[in-house]
């Protein structure tokens, strides 16, 4: 595929890659599929620089980030390391909290109002941001 | 790489007290809920009591319900059980078990409470 | 509390046999069980989770099935190394509890 040097349309560049903020609700593994439709993924935070950004931009609302431990451990969607990585939670957070009476706990991972993270229930119908990296390649084929 | 080590087992009398200790490595673990599990010498597993990442929630198995107190030290990496008035039922392998389907466990510890 | 019934609770089976174990939870768990092998003197190691994927590492013919109150794991050749006992726990709601366990035997 070609590279992609700058974002698509309604998209945020940032440091070298590109957001998109949603403005509607879906489950955590909808807005995975969303993003991943888009050659994205679920936005991945690396540093406070990029919460911040991402804190700007989405406001005091709940939005999905890409980080589950549906799987066990706690995972980035981009595959960065979770245990070394930039972490930003609540206080006593991640708590996997189980008295929602949904079924199961907590799996995946927002940003609350703060902007500091929670777990969740995956299924909640909340915000999301996808994210790309410029420079990698895309799917669409070459220009010939 | 994942590990958890449990510690603290032995002979204890009826009545007796003894305390576990689990030590974690190779993940956050703090950003885990944790738990004990036991498996009486030819039985089934039972779970025993789970602990939240920061401690603010705890649950416990009606049998060791007032007896047994979960706890944690996250800046140890350890998890611990405190167990107070022992009965002969208590007699068990005690394992400890990383999230609520235990997708990591421990080798475990035996405690063996005589009459 | 949400029972688990596990059936059988032991079976004789040859190296090659499809294998079948039953799960029956006492109320609707969606599909919040997971399938423990346990061989004899070591820890259980988790199987499968949310009642169908495959834990990293475990090979591909173990299979788990179900949601709501019935669930199945399948071993779909029988291996040497499987004979062991194995579990279902349902993590929906505390106290988290186990089935009773199935013991597979060599016939």
């Known amino acids: 595929g070609s590279e992609r040097t700058c974002c698509p349309v309604n998209w945020v560049e940032h440091e070298r890659s590109c957001y998109w903020f949603s403005r509607s609700g879906k489950a955590w593994a909808d807005a995975d599929n969303y993003c991943r439709l888009e050659d994205a993924h679920l936005v991945v935070v690396t540093s406070w620089e990029e919460q911040k950004f991402v804190q700007h931009h989405i406001g005091p609302v709940n939005t999905w980030m890409g980080l589950h431990d549906q799987n066990g451990p706690w995972k980035w969607v981009d595959g960065t390391d979770y245990e070394t990585g930039f972490k930003n939670w609540r206080p006593e957070q991640p708590d996997d909290w189980y008295g929602h009476g949904l079924g199961g706990g907590e799996d995946c991972a927002h940003f609350t109002d703060d902007g500091r993270w929670n777990d969740d229930v995956c299924q909640r119908p909340y915000r999301w941001v996808c994210e790309t990296e410029l420079d990698k390649a895309s799917q669409e084929p070459p220009l010939l | 790489e994942v590990q958890l080590v449990e510690s603290g087992g032995g002979l204890v009398k009826s009545g007796g007290s003894l305390r576990l200790s689990c030590a974690a490595s190779?993940?956050?673990?703090?950003?885990?809920?944790m738990n004990w599990v036991r498996q009486a010498p030819g039985k089934g597993l039972e779970w025993v009591s789970s602990i939240s990442g920061s401690s603010s929630y705890i649950d416990y198995a009606d049998s060791v319900k007032g007896r047994f107190t979960i706890s944690r030290d996250n800046a140890k990496n350890s998890l611990y059980l405190q167990m107070n008035s022992l009965r002969a039922e208590d007699t068990a392998v005690y394992y400890c078990a990383r999230k609520s389907w235990f997708d990591y466990w421990g080798q475990g510890t035996l405690v063996t409470v005589s009459s | 509390d949400i029972q688990m019934t596990q059936s059988p609770s032991s079976l004789s089976a040859s190296v090659g046999d499809r294998v079948t174990i039953t799960c029956r939870a006492s109320q609707d768990i969606s599909n919040y069980l997971v399938w423990f092998q346990q061989k004899l003197g070591k820890a259980p190691k988790s199987l499968i989770y949310v009642a169908s994927s495959l834990q990293s590492g475990v090979p591909s013919r173990f299979s788990g099935s179900g949601s709501g109150t019935d669930f199945t794991l399948t071993i779909s050749s029988l291996q040497p190394e499987d004979f062991a006992t194995y579990y279902c726990q349902q993590y929906n709601s505390y106290p988290l509890t186990f089935g009773g366990g199935t013991k597979v035997e060599i016939k």
């Open positions: 190779g993940f956050t673990f703090s950003s885990y809920r």
